[in-house]
Interface confidence: low
């Protein structure tokens, strides 16, 4: 048989907290337990689920937990099958609600002296105390002329006049716990000796030394009183106003107006009315004094035909907002179009060249009007005026190649040179017109050059080729003094190049012919033998037919070129001895010698007492020291020729003789032999 | 761009007669809300309104030294002048001229201001 | 006439420290308040106008604030350009009248 353990009670229970209907079985073989709701099987949810053989409630709801729940337990193999007793819950609960006007039926219907009952909807198990407030101070029962019964939703007021006006509220709490009513119930009874607003003022914007006026209107029964108050609650009325306000007038009807409004006009006026009875109504309008200030200047604008551009203008800051408009030729834009003003923005569709010129904006409110103009300018894609042309330019001369072109805005020119840019220096210049200036033309300049003119609506370009005419001129010039050597062969070239290949000659300055050894091959001078006679002046003539003829003058001069009679020789020397390094040299003019040591000449004038140069040109060193180690060279030079020879000098100790070496052993290498220079010790 | 530049005697004896112009440009006179007023400064000491004169030819004087000064205006010159009369030692100061805007800033524009010396 | 007290009457500061110098009125002004700053030598340059509205290119280290008869200019942290003399003035009524000045010197 099955057996109920533990068996589900009727409980109290909390709306919305847990809960828990307990069932423990005992049977034979194996039961299976389910739970029924007013006979209905219970299904499985989140906040209502079978937890063992009890039944869990996460949260109580009095709407699907209301009836009767019951535990069954069935044997499926015998089809035995037991059920608990009954149980259902004590649900506690509390729910806010609105207060409502039960009588009269409806808010028209409320007039002084008429009984008003308002209920307060909070509904609750167990039922609930209430609360009633007026403009949130609790009422008691008993107190002017209400009734109220905190275990009633009802409260009535027998008879309602106007100081029971008020917002209306009610609160009730009960075991469960507390709520507030969810809308509130504003009662307003008219007291007509209570002052009411007929005409309210309103902020007033005017600019300076224009009149204000504000309008105030109560009504009461009997009249109100009316009063007007500045910022600082002075009193403004006829008989008596604050200096500031001397020309402030307040109408019978209550209107207030400010003639010849000053800065110091502006601020809060205050409208009270006061009624008989009741508060005081303080109504408030502002005075603004009109203001503009400047406007932000424009930039220049360059557009391009057929685009579409916006130009905005920022209003300046100014009360009231001031209006935008734009301008063109003084007439006003219009809002549609294709060059129209939207919101601000000037709008220019399709640009056409005829757009071009000044637009103005304007802003104006009531305080003045400020105005801003923008330039606007169509750029135009450049027209030749003067394209480039081939040209020939002399060689040495500035020449120049033009590059004219009209467009709007001013266009830019570049030039380009074989396709690179040109880049203006020493040699380049482009002038504001465009031309390009080639300060000193040279033969390379002979190539394509090109220029282009740019406008923001575009560019064009041209080019032309440059030939350089070059000049008549010795290629190179020859040396103005050269020499030969006598009883040898020699050569003297001049060559020279023009527009026409030119002729070259040679003649003697004093214009006396060369001698039959002596021929003019081409512009090479040829001597087969030099003597002395053939020193002397010559002139080199290069001649064509445009560019006549220009002159080299050279003087030749004959000489015996140098040869060194003594060359110094591989020197070595003990430290403290004599070095001496010899050099002689030969020719016609009679060479020069000089000396360079460790890679500096050896100025005579300032050699110190350790060195000394020979009139026949050898070097002598005295008390050589291991620093005068190093090559020595020996320069031969006059007008015609230069000749150099070299050789080392080794600067070495001496070393101390051994017993076993005889007084005449020989040093281990070969030494020039120097004269000992004797230290005297004193 | 609004410049403000003051002309005046430099010397003159004490009783006579100060005459200050103040020429303007960047701005226009017949504009409503324009105002040009005169402000002078001793040497070392504070600054002292003295004038005003607003577009619509409405004036306003410093009420200490109100009957010895007139301020008038030349609109299509572009000019506003001050004269003081019966001047002393004390009127010894650089006079400056500036712009007033109603409604917005004012003094925002000074010149650089006229030194006058009045030494017998 | 409107009196304007100014105050101090100089002071010293160190670069980089907030700076206040006070206005006061004889009577209610507000907005209707200047500050200048003046340089040896120079004409006065507007710096706030109506209370605490920076006139354009002014640093924004400038700053000016009251209500009342009660105002108050305001450098955030000075810079060596900022040694002059700055004066307050009120143009709530005429005659327009100014503060004595505040000379400011680096410390």
């Known amino acids: 048989a099955i057996v109920f353990i533990k068996q589900p009670s009727s409980q109290d229970a909390l709306q919305g907290r847990r809960a828990l209907l307990r069932c423990e079985v005992e049977a034979p073989g194996p039961v299976h337990v389910y739970w029924l709701l007013d006979g209905a099987p219970v299904q499985d949810t989140e906040r209502r689920f079978a937890q063992g053989s009890s039944l869990s409630f996460a949260a109580v709801d009095r709407p699907q937990d209301s009836g009767t729940f019951q535990c069954v337990a069935r044997d499926d193999v015998t089809g035995e099958e037991a059920r608990s007793a009954n149980a259902s819950f004590n649900i506690k609960w509390i729910e806010a609600g609105p207060v409502v006007l039960k009588h009269p039926a409806s808010e028209a219907e409320i007039q002084p002296q008429t009984q008003v009952t308002l209920r307060c909807h909070i509904d609750g198990h167990p039922r609930p105390t209430y609360q009633w407030f007026r403009d949130g101070t609790p009422l008691s029962d008993g107190q002017s002329n209400h009734t109220v019964s905190s275990k009633e939703r009802n409260l009535t007021l027998r008879p309602a006049g106007p100081e029971h006006s008020g917002l209306y509220s009610c609160c009730a709490h009960s075991a469960f716990g507390q709520a507030c009513s969810s809308q509130n119930f504003t009662l307003s009874i008219a007291d007509e000796s209570f002052a009411r607003v007929v005409l309210a003022p309103q902020d007033v914007v005017v600019a300076r030394y224009e009149e204000a006026m504000f309008h105030c209107q109560f009504s009461a029964q009997p009249p109100p009183s009316l009063q007007w108050l500045f910022e600082d609650e002075t009193p403004i009325t006829n008989r008596s106003r604050p200096p500031h306000l001397r020309r402030a007038t307040v109408f019978a009807n209550g209107s207030l107006l400010l003639t010849q409004v000053r800065p110091r006009n502006a601020g809060i006026y205050r409208c009270i009315g006061q009624g008989q009875r009741g508060p005081p109504i303080i109504l408030e309008a502002t005075l603004h004094l009109a203001e503009i200030e400047d406007m932000p200047l424009f930039e220049p604008r360059v557009f391009t035909a057929g685009s579409e551009e916006r130009v905005t203008c920022l209003p300046p800051k100014g009360l009231p907002e001031p209006s935008v408009w734009w301008e063109h030729a003084g007439v006003r834009l219009p809002t549609h179009g294709r060059v129209y003003q939207k919101g601000h923005e000037l709008v220019l569709a399709n640009i056409a060249e005829s757009d071009a010129g000044v637009y103005t904006c304007h802003a104006a409110n009531l305080a003045g009007q400020r105005r801003q103009d923008v330039n606007i300018t169509v750029a135009t894609v450049p027209s030749w005026l003067k394209k480039p042309q081939d040209s020939q330019l002399e060689e040495g001369k500035p020449g120049y190649l033009d590059c004219l072109t009209q467009a709007t805005p001013k266009p830019t020119v570049v030039w380009y040179r074989n396709q690179m840019l040109i880049s203006e220096d020493s040699r380049f210049e482009v002038f504001k017109n465009g031309t390009l200036r080639i300060n000193s033309v040279e033969v390379y300049d002979g190539t394509w050059y090109r220029c282009m003119s740019s406008t923001p609506a575009g560019s064009i370009e041209a080019q032309a080729r440059v030939q350089v005419l070059e000049k008549l001129k010795f290629t190179p010039p020859p040396q103005p003094q050269q020499c030969m050597e006598f009883d040898k062969e020699a050569t003297v070239p001049c060559s020279a190049t023009g527009r026409e290949k030119p002729t070259i000659k040679w003649e003697r300055a004093d214009g006396s012919s060369l001698p039959e050894w002596v021929t003019d091959n081409a512009g090479t001078l040829h001597f087969a033998r030099v003597t002395r006679d053939d020193a002397g002046n010559y002139t080199c003539i290069a001649s064509n037919g445009p560019q006549g003829q220009i002159r080299a003058h050279v003087q030749l001069t004959v000489a015996v070129f140098i040869t060194f009679k003594v060359e110094p020789e591989r020197t070595t020397v003990y430290q403290g001895h004599t070095a001496l390094l010899q050099c002689e040299a030969q020719g016609d003019p009679k060479p020069l010698i000089q000396w360079k040591g460790k890679d500096r000449i050896l100025d005579p004038t300032k050699l110190g007492p350790r060195m000394h140069i020979f009139q026949n040109g050898s070097l002598v060193i005295h008390d050589v020291a291991p620093e005068d180690s190093g090559r020595y060279t020996c320069i031969a030079g006059n007008s015609c020729n230069i000749k150099h020879t070299e050789a080392p000098l080794y600067v070495v100790d001496k070393p101390v003789p051994e017993e076993s070496e005889g007084p005449g052993s020989p040093p281990p290498y070969k030494m020039i032999q120097t004269h000992h220079h004797h230290h005297h010790h004193h | 761009q609004v410049t403000l530049k003051e002309s005046g005697p430099g010397i003159l004896k004490p009783s006579q007669t100060l005459s200050l112009t103040c020429s303007f440009s960047g701005f226009s006179l017949s504009t409503s809300n324009m105002g040009v007023g005169w402000i002078r400064q001793p040497s070392g000491k504070g600054l002292e309104w003295l004038a005003h004169?607003?577009?619509?030819?409405?004036?306003y004087y410093n009420p200490s030294l109100k009957s010895q000064l007139t301020i008038s205006k030349d609109t299509s010159r572009n000019q506003v002048f001050l004269k003081i009369t019966s001047v002393d030692t004390e009127d010894t100061a650089t006079y400056y001229c500036?712009?007033?805007?109603?409604?917005?800033?004012?003094?925002?524009?000074w010149g650089q201001g006229t030194l006058v010396t009045v030494s017998a | 006439d409107i009196k304007m007290t100014q105050s101090p009457s100089s002071m010293y500061a160190s670069l980089g420290e907030r700076v206040t110098i006070t206005c006061k009125a004889s009577?209610?002004?507000?907005?209707?308040l200047n500050w200048f700053q003046q340089k040896p030598g120079k004409s006065p340059k507007t710096l706030i106008y109506r209370t605490n509205r920076l006139l354009d290119g002014v640093p924004s280290r400038f700053s000016g604030s009251g209500s009342g008869q009660d105002y108050s200019l305001t450098i955030s942290s000075l810079d060596y350009e900022d040694m002059g003399i700055y004066y307050c003035?009120?143009?709530?009524?005429?005659?327009?009248?100014f503060g004595a000045g505040t000379k400011l010197e680096l410390k």
């Open positions: 500036v712009r007033s805007n109603y409604g917005y800033a004012w003094f925002a524009y």
């Open positions: 009577q209610d002004i507000y907005p209707y």
């Open positions: 003035l009120q143009y709530d009524e005429f005659p327009l009248t």
């Open positions: 004169i607003w577009w619509d030819d409405d004036k």
